[in-house]
């Protein structure tokens, strides 16, 4: 039950995380104009991964796409790539994890297969989350560097009374969405990996069990018991029948009541 809950919760958390990564990637507010020097600006600038926008006090907003690929900074391209890789991996992970969910029956899929799929999706979610966090962090670092560079050159042409104020950019909402979403995807992935451990069946459930009757001895192997009942509680090599069943190692030292008639 705990395994199912962990797996289900991991799936939901990852789903929310990946939706957040997609939202962050599409958002225009990766960087927003710093209003420290002019809190009542009549023209507000903000930029995303795909386009830059200007919102005027009049209410009009104009957005322009970056219609060049070669002219863009390498860092921006890297951030785009990281976010897209994160989305792709996350989407594949979601697809895999749907089939891996314990609560969903697909044909006669064994627990071992579901465990493998859960682990695969978990790893994909972890990498997806890391890609998103890395992408957002690279962009944030780029902003911080540019912010202090433009602060140093805040006013150019101060020889006369004319001032040219450089626009500085600070963290936009998309960065925070990206960090949170990446974190959620990462957590979801870890939960899936934890769930995988609970799903994985033991390699050898039980050793052969010997039954010694008076006339002849017959060996039984009730290794299929756990699988046939459909319950996953007996994962250790426990003795199932206390009446007369013993492992082969125990037979010599402990006589059974069936040895003497």
């Amino acid at each position: 039950m705990a395994v199912t809950a962990c797996q289900g919760l991991g799936f939901v958390v990852s789903l929310i995380g990946i939706a957040g990564i997609i939202a962050a990637t599409c958002m225009d507010q990766w960087s927003t104009q710093d209003l420290y020097n002019n809190p009542v600006t009549a023209v507000f600038n903000y930029q995303g991964l795909w386009r830059s926008c200007v919102r005027e006090s009049s209410g009009f907003t104009e957005c322009r796409g970056y219609f060049t690929l070669l002219g863009l900074p390498a860092m921006l391209q890297a951030v785009r790539a990281l976010m897209i890789v994160g989305i792709v991996l996350g989407a594949i992970g979601l697809l895999v994890s749907i089939f891996a969910l314990k609560c969903i029956r697909i044909g006669s899929m064994e627990d071992s297969a579901k465990a493998n799929m859960t682990l695969t999706s978990g790893i994909m979610f972890i990498v997806s989350g890391l890609c998103a966090i890395a992408g957002v962090s690279v962009f944030a670092n780029m902003l911080v560097t540019n912010f202090w560079m433009s602060t140093a050159n805040m006013y150019t042409g101060m020889g006369g009374m004319v001032q040219t104020v450089q626009t500085r950019y600070t963290f936009g909402a998309a960065l925070f969405v990206g960090w949170v979403a990446g974190g959620l995807t990462l957590i979801g992935g870890v939960m899936m990996c934890i769930a995988c451990r609970g799903l994985a069946p033991e390699e050898t459930n039980y050793k052969a069990v010997s039954y010694h009757a008076s006339g002849h001895s017959v060996a039984y192997k009730p290794g299929g018991f756990k699988a046939s009942t459909g319950f996953g509680s007996n994962t250790k090599n426990k003795k199932i029948y206390d009446g007369g069943a013993r492992t082969e190692d125990e037979v010599q030292s402990y006589p059974s009541k069936h040895d003497y008639v």
Epitope: A42, V54, S58, G59, Q163, T164
Partner: antibody, heavy 118, light 113 residues
Framework: EVQLLESGGGLVQPGGSLRLSCAAS????????MSWVRQAPGKGLEWVAT????????YYPDSVKGRFTISRDNAKNTLYLQMNSLRAEDTAVYYC???????????WGQGTLVTVSS | DIVMTQSPDSLAVSLGERATINCKSS????????????LTWYQQKPGQPPKLLIY???TRESGVPDRFSGSGSGTDFTLTISSLQAEDVAVYYC?????????FGGGTKLEIK
Amino acid sequence: EVQLLESGGGLVQPGGSLRLSCAASEFTFSNYAMSWVRQAPGKGLEWVATISSGRSSTYYPDSVKGRFTISRDNAKNTLYLQMNSLRAEDTAVYYCAGLGRGNAMEYWGQGTLVTVSS
Amino acid sequence: DIVMTQSPDSLAVSLGERATINCKSSQSLLNSGNQKNYLTWYQQKPGQPPKLLIYWASTRESGVPDRFSGSGSGTDFTLTISSLQAEDVAVYYCQNAYSYPFTFGGGTKLEIK
């Protein structure tokens, strides 16, 4: 044709109050940020206040801050300017204007005269 | 606050001649986000409210005759009337539309010589 019609002007004593109204027609009033601009007799234009389309933001110059309040009722397509603690230097023709692209004052009313005198 | 300085204060030009009005701002009106200059020109005829002529320093408002043109960038701007008509007699104002408080130039009175 877009129409902006100001009303509420008149003679008022220094320290008194007045409320100007601007009724808009023939355009989507709720989509536009609106401003008040005044012009003292024989003088140039002076911006007085601006309100965003969603009523969330208001802006004033230091000369009227704390004394004037701009507001709007989108349901009634009406813009208001509440003027308190009026001074002689507030005497002017008050125009309401609708802001368009480039924050330009695209639509103008005919103006209403406010005279502050004892 | 951004100070807008217009020159000349008054200008007399013959009909059919070119009229040029200058406007200088104390700070750049160029927005780096869209590379547009937030300078607006208005025309005010006697007894009438102002009328929008040009926004973004060079974009003509619809319905404005093409003899009116705006140019300039950063801090220096110009309004040009290529061929003066009798109906162009008015006072012309430039305005900072880039940051609050919005400020107007002192105005240039255009007359016929």
